[in-house]
Amino acid sequence: MAVTACQGLGFVVSLIGIAGIIAATCMDQWSTQDLYNNPVTAVFNYQGLWRSCVRESSGFTECRGYFTLLGLPAMLQAVRALMIVGIVLGAIGLLVSIFALKCIRIGSMEDSAKANMTLTSGIMFIVSGLCAIAGVSVFANMLVTNFWMSTANMYTGMGGMVQTVQTRYTFGAALFVGWVAGGLTLIGGVMMCIACRGLAPEETNYKAVSYHASGHSVAYKPGGFKASTGFGSNTKNKKIYDGGARTEDEVQSYPSKHDYV
């Protein structure tokens, strides 16, 4: 039950995270005009990964796409790439995790297969989250660098009568959405990996083997001490495993392979 809950929660958290990564990637407010030096501006600038916008106090907003590919800064291209890779990996991870969900039955898919799929999707979510966090962090670093560079420029070369107010940009809402979304996707991925451990059968399914001791005629069968040795009725380990199928509730009830020496 705990495994199902962990897997389900991991899926939901990752789903929210990836939705957030998509939203952040599409948002225009990656960087917004810093109003510290000009809080009474009638024109507000903000920029995204794909276009830059200007909102006038009249209410009119004009957005222009970056219609060049080669003319864009390499860092911006890198951020775009990281976000897209994050979205693609996350989307594939979601697709895989849907089939891996314990609560969904698909034919006679074994738990080992579901465990593998859960682990795969978990890793994909972790990488997706890391890509988003990395992308947002690279952009944030770029903003901080440019901010201080433009600040330095503002306080030099102002000897003339005419003031040229340089537009500085600070963190936009998309950065915070991206960080939170990346974190959620990462957490969801970790939860999926944890769920995978609970799903995976820990022992190799050995066939029942008879070991003939020299003194006694005692048959040891994997699956519990059940024979003429007098250890008697261990109710929990009543089932004698023959490598066959088992019910869902019994997944964690069998002994591990290290019990057999």
């Epitope: 009474v40 501006t41 209410g59 009119f60 107010v165």
Partner: antibody, heavy 119, light 113 residues
Framework: EVQLVESGGGLVQPGGSLRLSCAAS????????MHWVRQAPGKGLEWVSY????????YYADTVKGRFTISRDNAKNSLYLQMNSLRAEDTAVYYC????????????WGQGTTVTVSS | DVVLTQSPDSLAVSLGERATINCKSS????????????LTWYQQKPGQTPKLLIY???TRKSGVPDRFSGSGSGTDFTLTISSLQAEDVAVYYC?????????FGGGTKVEIK
């Protein structure tokens, strides 16, 4: 057709108060920022105040700051200018105008209402 | 605050001749975000309300005759009437619409010589 009609002007003594109104029609009033601009007799235009569509941003000229208050009622399609502590230099024709156009330009103007501050 | 200085204060031009009005700003009105200058020109005829002519320093409002043109960038702007007509007799104002307060220039009175 966009129409802006000012009212509330008149003669008032120095130190007195007056409330100007501007009734708007012909456009979605609640979507646009509104301005008050004044013109003293024989003088140039002087911008007075601005209020954004949702009243979130309000600005005043330094000459009226602390004495004038701009407000709007989107339900009534009305703009207001509460003028307190009036001075002789506030005597002017007061226009309400809207930033209906690109570039923050004031495209539509009312006919104006005259405020005279005199003892 | 942005201070706009218009010159000349008044201008007398013959019909059909070119009229040029200058407007100088104390601060740049150029917005890097959209590469536009936030300066507007208005015309106010005697006894009338002001009328918008040009926005973004050089974009003519629809319905405004093409003899009116705006130019300039940053801090120096010009309004040109290529061929003055009798109906162009008015006072012309430039306005900063880049930052509050949205200051106006002192105005330039255009008359017929």
């Amino acid at each position: 057709e966009v129409q802006l009609v000012e009212s509330g002007g008149g003669l008032v003594q120095p130190g007195g108060s007056l409330r100007l109104s501007c009734a708007a029609s012909g456009f979605t009033f609640s979507s646009f920022g509104m301005h008050w601009v004044r013109q003293a007799p024989g003088k140039g235009l002087e911008w007075v105040s601005y209020i954004s569509s949702g009243s979130g941003s309000i600005y005043y000229a330094d000459t009226v700051k602390g004495r004038f208050t701009i407000s709007r009622d989107n339900a009534k399609n009305s703009l207001y200018l509460q003028m307190n502590s009036l001075r002789a230099e506030d005597t002017a024709v007061y226009y309400c105008a809207t930033s209906y156009y690109y570039g923050n330009a004031l495209e539509y103007w009312g006919q104006g209402t005259t405020v005279t501050v005199s003892s | 605050d942005v201070v706009l200085t218009q010159s000349p204060d008044s201008l007398a031009v013959s019909l059909g001749e070119r009229a040029t009005i200058n407007c100088k700003s104390s601060q740049s009105l150029f917005n890097v975000g959209n590469q536009k200058n936030y300066l507007t020109w208005y015309q106010q005829k005697p006894g009338q309300t002001p009328k918008l002519l040009i926005y973004w320093a050089s974009t003519r409002k629809s319905g405004v005759p093409d003899r009116f043109s705006g130019s300039g960038s940053g801090t120096d702007f010009t309004l040109t009437i290529s061929s003055l007509q009798a109906e162009d007799v008015a006072v012309y104002y430039c306005q900063n619409v880049y930052s509050y307060p949205l200051t106006f220039g002192g105005g330039t009175k255009v008359e017929i010589k």
